[in-house]
């Protein structure tokens, strides 16, 4: 028995299955509480840059400084964690770049320190002293076996030096590790000599080898990753997303839904709507409309952008995610204010997912 009346088809997957859908993995900036963080908006030719956090407009305050393409957060706290975006408005178009900020005392796994360190690992050599690659911090490499719960972030590091400065590449199970080998790809931070995989799934299990080489030699080190999970799971949605938002009539707003799934996720954005002046069908169930869903013709389904909003756009927006195992959904409310009222952050209400056991 469906719990709603369909205004548009809300079948689980698109009619044409997506061939290349990937879970988006924004750049992650990690800071310890109390530290300052500076991020540069990685967009070119920006006439005007606007910033959002969790889909809500971000303005300057006593801890947040916005200068040109830079965002500075002074004395970071865990409340500063979230999904940030900078939007570059140009004369003909606009473009948005997303990144995550994680203010935490410890990284999920694979390292004892966060990603703001590493400067000590980048050893500069006297240009005359030619030297084959060597490890600069073997303590960070002692733990070879990493047993990590699914959906966690894994970081492997191989801090090295040499002259000329060595290059680093990674192998998985002895073969070249390519971005397309895992949903969401991976990140290599050359300045930190690290490989980062977010939201690991069972197929990420295996041996990961860093190969560090220059013209005078090559060294390597292998880590073993075990992803601990005994049965496939329904999708997991990041708590607090999408976040409630408010804007004025004519304004723009974004809702973001962060998805972790070890099986292909299908994302739908759904809104309660009226049909013939009624919010409910003859059966007493609410009318719902699918605003966006993942598929061949849909880009970045995790983000729902609304432009030039009207009062009719106010209401509840549902992010519904499914894989072959099950579903999850979370929702947020959009408040549309009259033109004279400035938008403000609403009291946050995190909708409970519907799959609690």
């Amino acid at each position: 028995r469906p719990s709603f009346s369909l205004v548009e088809d809300t079948t689980l997957e698109p009619e044409e299955p997506p061939t290349k859908y990937q879970i988006s993995q924004p750049e992650v900036y990690v800071a310890a509480p109390g530290e300052s963080l500076e991020v540069r908006c990685l967009l070119k030719d920006a006439a005007v840059i606007s910033w959002t956090k969790d889909g809500v407009h971000l303005g300057p305050n006593n801890r947040t400084v916005l200068i040109g393409e830079y965002l500075q957060i002074k004395g970071a706290t865990p409340r500063d964690s979230g999904l940030y975006a900078c939007t570059a408005s140009r004369t003909v178009d606009s473009e948005t770049w997303y990144f995550m900020v994680n203010v935490t005392d410890a990284i999920s796994s694979g390292d004892d320190e966060d990603d703001t360190d590493g400067a000590e690992d980048f050893v500069s050599e006297n240009s005359n002293n030619k030297r084959a690659p060597y490890w600069t911090n073997t303590e960070k490499m002692e733990k070879r076996l990493h047993a990590v719960p699914a959906a966690n972030t894994v970081k492997f590091r191989c801090p090295a030096g040499g002259n000329p400065m060595p290059t680093m590449r990674w192998l998985k199970n002895g073969k070249e590790f390519k971005q397309e080998h895992r949903i969401g790809g991976y990140k290599v931070r050359n300045q930190h000599w690290s490989l980062i995989m977010e939201s690991v799934v069972p197929s990420d299990k295996g041996n990961y080898t860093c190969v560090v080489e220059n013209e005078y030699g090559s060294i390597n080190h292998t880590y073993h990753l075990d992803v601990v999970e005994r049965s496939p799971h329904r999708p997991i949605l990041q708590a607090g997303l999408p976040a409630n938002a408010s804007t004025v009539v004519g304004g723009d707003v974004e809702f973001v839904c962060k998805v972790y799934s070890d099986a292909q996720p299908h994302i739908q954005w759904i809104k309660h709507v009226e049909k013939n002046g009624s919010k409910y069908g003859p059966d007493g169930l609410p009318y719902l409309k699918v605003l966006k869903h993942s598929g061949i013709n849909s880009s970045n389904a995790e983000v729902l952008a609304l432009f030039n909003v009207t009062e009719a756009d106010a209401g509840e927006y549902i992010c519904k995610v499914s894989n072959y195992i099950g579903q999850a959904n979370q929702s947020a409310w959009l408040t549309v204010l009259p033109k004279q009222q400035a938008p403000g952050r609403e009291k946050e209400i995190t909708a409970s997912p519907d799959y609690l056991e």
Epitope: P2, E180, P232, Q327
Partner: antibody
């Protein structure tokens, strides 16, 4: 423990319909897709469709979209698969499965004039 | 639809042999692949999910590998109870297509 118990064998004439049931127990019924897979004699496995009992969402293989109907009764933790306009090539064993991890014992449907 | 091609379609092996079955997807399915074992008159049994992860209650002699388009199921030392038909399945997107099956017979 998780169990899926299917209804008994059926013999149908061409053009008729058949409704196979799958009763689930041992887990929270609403929280997992129930998939239907069929296997013709001596052949491989073919996915037909799935239903999410919590809200009745369905997804079908295009080959069966017109003829197959999946429904769920949360009060009895039972899913039904109805296949209409039967033809001889629909003779097969029909399985229900919870997210492909746990499977029913299968229901044999024979279509013969 | 994503096509799944298994090879070989059948093989003969002896107890204790190492057996390898391959599965190729017509397009990149990342690690979204399951392996099943089926014995005559019985329902399929999940062996491996997510390409590499052993399902509950499955002996460790079974292992899965691969990602993208090429996948392998390996039985390290074939046991008498392993003689059966094995199927791979795409679980990336609907329709969730199966491979044609590989029948493992006694030599």
């Amino acid at each position: 423990q998780v169990q899926l118990v299917q209804s008994g064998a059926e013999v149908k004439k061409p053009g008729a319909s058949v409704k196979v049931s799958c009763k689930a127990s041992g887990y929270i019924f609403r929280n997992y897709y129930i998939h239907w897979v069929r296997q013709a004699p001596g052949q491989g496995l073919e996915w037909m469709g799935a239903i999410y009992p919590d809200n009745g969402d369905t997804s079908y293989n295009q080959r069966f979209k017109v003829r197959a109907t999946l429904t769920a009764d949360t009060s009895t933790s039972t899913v039904y698969m109805e296949l209409s306009s039967l033809r001889s090539e629909d003779t097969a064993v029909y399985y229900c499965a919870r997210a492909f991890t746990y499977w029913g014992q299968g229901t044999t449907v024979t279509v013969s004039s | 639809d994503i096509q799944m091609t298994q090879s070989p379609s059948s093989l003969s092996a002896s107890v204790g042999d190492r057996v390898t079955i391959t599965c190729r997807a017509s397009e990149n399915i990342y690690g979204a692949l399951n392996w099943y074992q089926q014995k005559p008159g019985k329902a399929p049994k999940l062996l491996i999910y997510g390409a590499t992860n052993l399902a509950d209650g499955v002996p460790s002699r079974f292992s899965g590998s691969g990602s993208g388009t090429d996948f392998t199921l390996t039985i390290s030392s074939l046991q008498p109870e392993d003689f059966a038909t094995y199927y791979c399945q795409n679980v990336l997107s609907t329709p969730y297509t199966f491979g044609g099956g590989t029948k493992v017979e006694i030599k």
